[in-house]
């Protein structure tokens, strides 16, 4: 079977600071040197791109400076962190992996990680 399998956790709870981390692991059918990882958010039937990064195997994963994502890579495993999340960002976050080079191109899409974000309660005013 030449299809690429992508695994990611089913559920992740964001921290009180709005940070969520999860691992995206892929079983590569070929020896890719250039890999593109994209995080997609699916809400209802709408799919939007959250962030994306292309990296050379053995090198670090670099997202754009203004991206809400950071990440590290190790072999066929990518550790992704999404920051600045709020309760309204709760949803299904899909890891998409593309083997860009050398040919042939392969696409792999995970089943998605449901990220739950709970806005912290505002601190009550304290009277002294």
């Amino acid at each position: 079977c030449k299809a690429m399998h992508v695994a990611q956790p089913a559920v992740v709870l964001a921290s009180s600071r709005g940070i969520a981390s999860f691992v995206c692991e892929y079983a590569s059918p070929g020896k890719a040197t250039e890999v593109r990882v994209t995080v997609l958010r699916q809400a209802d039937s709408q799919v939007t791109e959250v962030c994306a990064a292309t990296y050379m195997m053995g090198n670090e994963l670099t997202f754009l400076d203004d991206s809400i994502c950071t990440g590290t890579s190790s072999g066929n495993q990518v550790n992704l962190t999404i920051q600045g999340l709020r309760a309204m960002d709760t949803g299904l976050y899909i890891c998409k992996v593309e083997l860009m080079y050398p040919p042939p191109y392969y696409l792999g899409i995970g089943n998605g990680t449901q990220i739950y974000v709970i806005d912290p309660e505002p601190c009550p005013d304290s009277d002294f």
Partner: antibody, heavy 118, light 107 residues
Framework: QVQLVESGGGVVQPGRSLRLSCAAS????????IHWVRQAPGKGLEWVAV????????YYADSVKGRFTISRDNSKNTLYLQMNSLRAEDTAVYYC???????????WGQGTLVTVSS | DIQMTQSPSSLSASVGDRVTITCRAS??????LAWYQQKPGKVPKLLIY???TLQSGVPSRFSGSGSGTDFTLTISSLQPEDVATYYC?????????FGQGTKVEIK
């Protein structure tokens, strides 16, 4: 709404060249890979070429490799297909199609007919 | 390259009939399979992706199943507006190959 509009088709002699264009609107063009797909008269769909969102990667069907070149101008929201050394078997309706974020082709243009004949 | 083979190449059925079209990939493509509908003289339209996920706005009488190499498109109750040619497509890897198409007609 998402729109793809092809142009540039016509009748051309074997061995000559033609350039097709695909004007996109209604979405962030620079975020999507775009494909060319063709359909010979009375035949099925044949994938021709794709170009990545930023133009960094291109793939071609074996039948057009070395003769066709796909390109894009993100500042003009336009995709191109330069077709050289045209053959009779290249006669087809040429569609541009958007590769969705999840992979399949979710929006298609209306197509432009290319006829290669002497 | 992955070859996609559809069967039958054409079929004729009555309104209300259940219609099944099969698509076989020459090697495993997991669930990276799409189905398209092309009505006569019209542009192809995405019906189903990920083998079984209905594209937004597509009637629920259409369904897809399968994984690996064998896939099925089912129309649970054929309607006159379903007269079209249906294509399966691999999008697991390049090239993005299509099946040869199945023409559906009304008896």
């Amino acid at each position: 709404q998402v729109q793809l509009v092809e142009s540039g088709g016509g009748v051309v002699q074997p061995g000559r060249s033609l350039r097709l264009s695909c004007a996109a609107s209604g979405f962030t063009f620079s975020s999507y890979g775009i494909h060319w797909v063709r359909q010979a008269p009375g035949k099925g769909l044949e994938w021709v070429a794709v170009i990545w969102y930023d133009g960094s990667n291109k793939y071609y069907a074996d039948s057009v490799k070395g003769r066709f070149t796909i390109s894009r101008d993100n500042s003009k929201n336009t995709l191109y297909l330069q077709m050289n050394s045209l053959r009779a078997e290249d006669t087809a309706v040429y569609y541009c199609a958007r590769g969705s974020l999840l992979g399949p082709f979710d929006y298609w243009g209306q197509g432009t007919l290319v006829t290669v004949s002497s | 390259d992955i070859q996609m083979t559809q069967s039958p190449s054409s079929l004729s059925a009555s309104v209300g009939d259940r219609v099944t079209i099969t698509c076989r990939a020459s090697q495993g493509i997991s669930n990276y399979l799409a189905w398209y509908q092309q009505k006569p003289g019209k542009v192809p339209k995405l019906l189903i992706y990920a083998a079984s996920t209905l594209q937004s706005g597509v009637p629920s009488r259409f369904s897809g199943s399968g994984s690996g190499t064998d896939f099925t498109l089912t129309i649970s109750s054929l309607q006159p507006e379903d007269v079209a040619t249906y294509y399966c497509q691999n999008y697991n890897s390049a090239p993005w190959t299509f099946g040869q198409g199945t023409k559906v007609e009304i008896k």
